[in-house]
């Protein structure tokens, strides 16, 4: 059976501006090898091109001219002696896209063109986007190895010029930025930043780029306690806050961590082990009591670590007024006054406006004071009958107000009753 | 340090909606609240409402609970704030703050005018 | 909702002069209130958080204090920027809320 010029090639190939293609190729031509064995030769040509004096565009013929624009660009892969007439573009421009024809020589018999069999090349705008790799997850401190790649790019052509860029950079030196792998140390701030790598090849307009968010995972550093959305002062990892007895009190506490860390409060100082009374980073008091004084913890528990803040509560009241009330007993009139306050309250006598300090000199009054707890007690001793109506007031006060209260003693020694007198400092 | 840029002045017609946003940079996003604020002209300060940008948790002033919806947007380190059914009482300049125990930082203010 | 009553609303004062600003309290909001500066151009910045603790920055010609319900901001000698407006703003309950302000004049 005679061997006849046969060309095996896809009709047409669509390749992406830059991007690289493999055409599979293979042919047969008739060739009988009784003598002389002459060298084969097979050429790729633009369509249209007459093959005796035309550049070509691929040949393993090292005395034809090759296109310019196609050297190093379009190769023969693949063994010609083989009939393997595969074709391998690199950096595809847009100018390549056109028709091509195959062509084998081989002595003075074989000398053909496949005309019927033309390769149609299309060369499209550049949509491919670069693949960022890297071992996930990112852990904020320990450096990671990035990488960056085009898939279906190759070497052929001028070089691939990378930049990256994203906040996570910011300390790396321009060089580092320049190359297809950088080595990235992650920060917890650079957790949800984008980092973009984008390709370029040089001499070439043709750039790409993909972005990728940066999942940062990163133990709390900071723990913060919000009062209706406004931070609290931190002073050695303690927050202190005065609150009102019986005022609702209902803080937020918050560590920022990747993945959430798990917030809970707890009562006091706790062990590592012990039971919280919010599994939230709220913390609601409805009304808080003086026996919440001291304290609450808010901890930040988390698979890289664990934090923990001590909120530091004082429980405090204004003054509250028992009295005054007073009775004639031997020793002349007696008066008494009690206060309940946190802070306990300082208190002050005054007779007709006039304050009674300590005890008189002449030995006219004498006051004595004693505090238990919350409570402040006083008692105001006068001594002699009164001559005239009097006005005697006792007034308690503390840091976060005061409260007076008064009797009006009438001549006769009789009281006309008790007034209580609320007052702020 | 710190700075919260927020978004160019905006005119509205009533009855319209608007969204406003406070990019932050400069620090961890979602570790501080955001809380934003309205001035009217020439008047005092009121307090919207805020948000927590890592839990999404809010909280409003009743008085702009059906007008005013906080969110955060972490990836962009973003605060919105949408305003819905605007009347020329909603004309003010709105600002978002952030709280930290170490200090507050402002935006410079949105200026929103309703008119028709 | 806690109001805070601030006086005066505008105070006419020389450079170098000490001045007072006062912010009542309708409620008890216990160490919970701040001080805020807002410039003309609208610039607004913390002065004072949690009643006395100057923020970072913050000249130390002020300071803030309390009596009971009254919390005051003092400038102790006037200087030519602390002539703009002053807002007191109380997070002791929601919603905050803030004094209606204190216009400072040079005179």
């Known amino acids: 059976e005679k061997p006849v010029y046969e060309l095996q090639v896809q009709k047409s190939v669509t390749v992406q501006e830059g991007l690289c293609v493999l055409v599979p190729c293979s042919f047969s031509y008739p060739w009988r090898s009784w003598y002389s064995s002459p060298p084969l030769y097979v050429y790729w040509f633009r369509d249209g091109e007459i093959p005796y004096y035309a550049e070509v565009v691929a040949t393993n013929n090292p005395d034809r001219r090759v296109k310019p624009e196609t050297q190093g660009r379009f190769r023969l892969l693949g063994d010609v002696q083989k009939k393997n007439c595969s074709l391998s573009i690199g950096d595809a421009r847009m100018e390549d896209t056109g028709s091509y024809f195959f062509r084998v020589e081989r002595g003075r018999d074989v000398k053909y063109s496949y005309q019927q069999n033309k390769l149609n090349l299309e060369v499209t705008a550049l949509i491919e986007k670069p693949d960022i790799h890297f071992l996930e997850p990112l852990e904020s401190g320990r450096p990671t190895r990035l990488s960056c790649s085009l898939p279906g790019s190759c070497e052929a052509g001028p070089p691939l010029t990378f930049s990256w860029t994203g906040n996570a950079l910011s300390p790396l030196d321009p060089e580092t930025t320049r190359s297809s792998e950088l080595t990235l140390t992650p920060r917890p701030e650079d957790h949800g930043t984008n980092l973009t790598c984008q390709m370029k090849r040089q001499g070439a307009q043709v750039t790409t780029e993909r972005t990728v968010q940066l999942n940062v995972s990163y133990a709390p550093q900071t723990i913060t306690i919000f009062r209706n959305g406004i931070a609290l002062e931190i002073l050695q990892n303690t927050s202190y806050l005065p609150v009102l007895e019986g005022q609702a009190l209902r803080l937020l506490c918050d560590a920022p961590s990747n993945p959430p860390a798990h917030l809970s409060w707890f009562q006091g100082s706790p062990a590592l082990n012990a039971t919280p009374i919010s599994n939230t980073g709220i913390l609601e008091l409805r009304r808080v009591r003086s026996a919440e004084e001291g304290g609450f913890t808010c901890r930040a528990q988390h698979p890289l670590g664990f934090l923990q803040i001590f909120l530091n509560l004082s429980v405090y009241s204004l003054p509250q007024l028992l009295g005054p009330s007073c009775s004639w007993e031997a020793e002349g009139l007696h008066c008494r006054c009690s206060f309940r306050a946190r802070p306990a309250p300082s208190l002050c006598w005054r007779l007709e406006e006039k304050p009674l300090e300590g005890n008189s000199s002449q030995g006219s009054f004498k006051v004595n004071s004693s505090s238990a707890g919350p409570w402040a007690n006083s008692s105001l001793i006068l001594h002699g009958g009164l001559s005239s109506d009097l006005k005697v007031s006792c007034k308690a006060w503390n840091i976060y107000g005061s409260q007076s209260g008064s009797v009006l003693l009438l001549q006769g020694r009789s009281n006309l009753g008790t007034g209580v007198v609320p007052a702020a400092l | 340090q710190a700075y919260l840029q927020q978004s160019g002045a905006e005119l509205a017609r009533p009855g319209a909606s608007v969204k406003m946003s406070c990019k932050a940079s400069?620090?961890?996003?979602?570790?501080?609240?955001m809380y934003w604020v309205k001035q009217r002209p020439g008047q005092g300060l009121e307090w919207i409402g805020y948000?927590?940008?890592?839990?999404?948790?809010?909280e409003y002033n009743q008085k702009f609970k059906d007008k005013a919806t906080l969110t955060a947007d972490k990836s962009s380190s973003t605060a919105y704030m949408q305003l819905i059914s605007l009347t020329s009482e909603d004309s003010a300049v709105y600002y978002c703050?952030?709280?930290?125990?170490?200090?507050?930082?402002w935006g410079q203010g949105t200026t929103l005018t309703v008119s028709s | 909702d806690v109001v805070m009553t601030q006086s005066p609303s505008s105070l006419s004062a020389s450079l170098g002069e000490r001045v007072s600003l006062t912010c009542r309290a309708s409620?008890?909001?216990?160490?919970?209130l701040n001080w805020l500066q807002q410039e003309p151009d609208g610039t607004i910045k913390r002065l004072i958080s949690?009643?006395?603790s100057l923020d970072s920055g913050v000249p130390k010609r002020f300071s803030g204090s309390r009596s009971g319900s009254d919390y005051s901001l003092t400038i102790s000698s006037l200087e030519s920027e602390d002539f703009v407006d002053y807002y007191c703003?109380?997070?002791?309950?929601?919603?905050?809320?803030f004094g209606a302000g204190t216009k400072l004049e040079l005179k």
């Open positions: 703050a952030r709280s930290d125990s170490k200090g507050d930082y």
């Open positions: 400069g620090y961890t996003f979602s570790s501080y609240t």
């Open positions: 948000i927590n940008p890592s839990s999404g948790y809010t």
């Open positions: 409620q008890d909001i216990g160490n919970s």
């Open positions: 949690a009643t006395s």
């Open positions: 703003l109380q997070y002791a309950s929601s919603p905050l809320t």
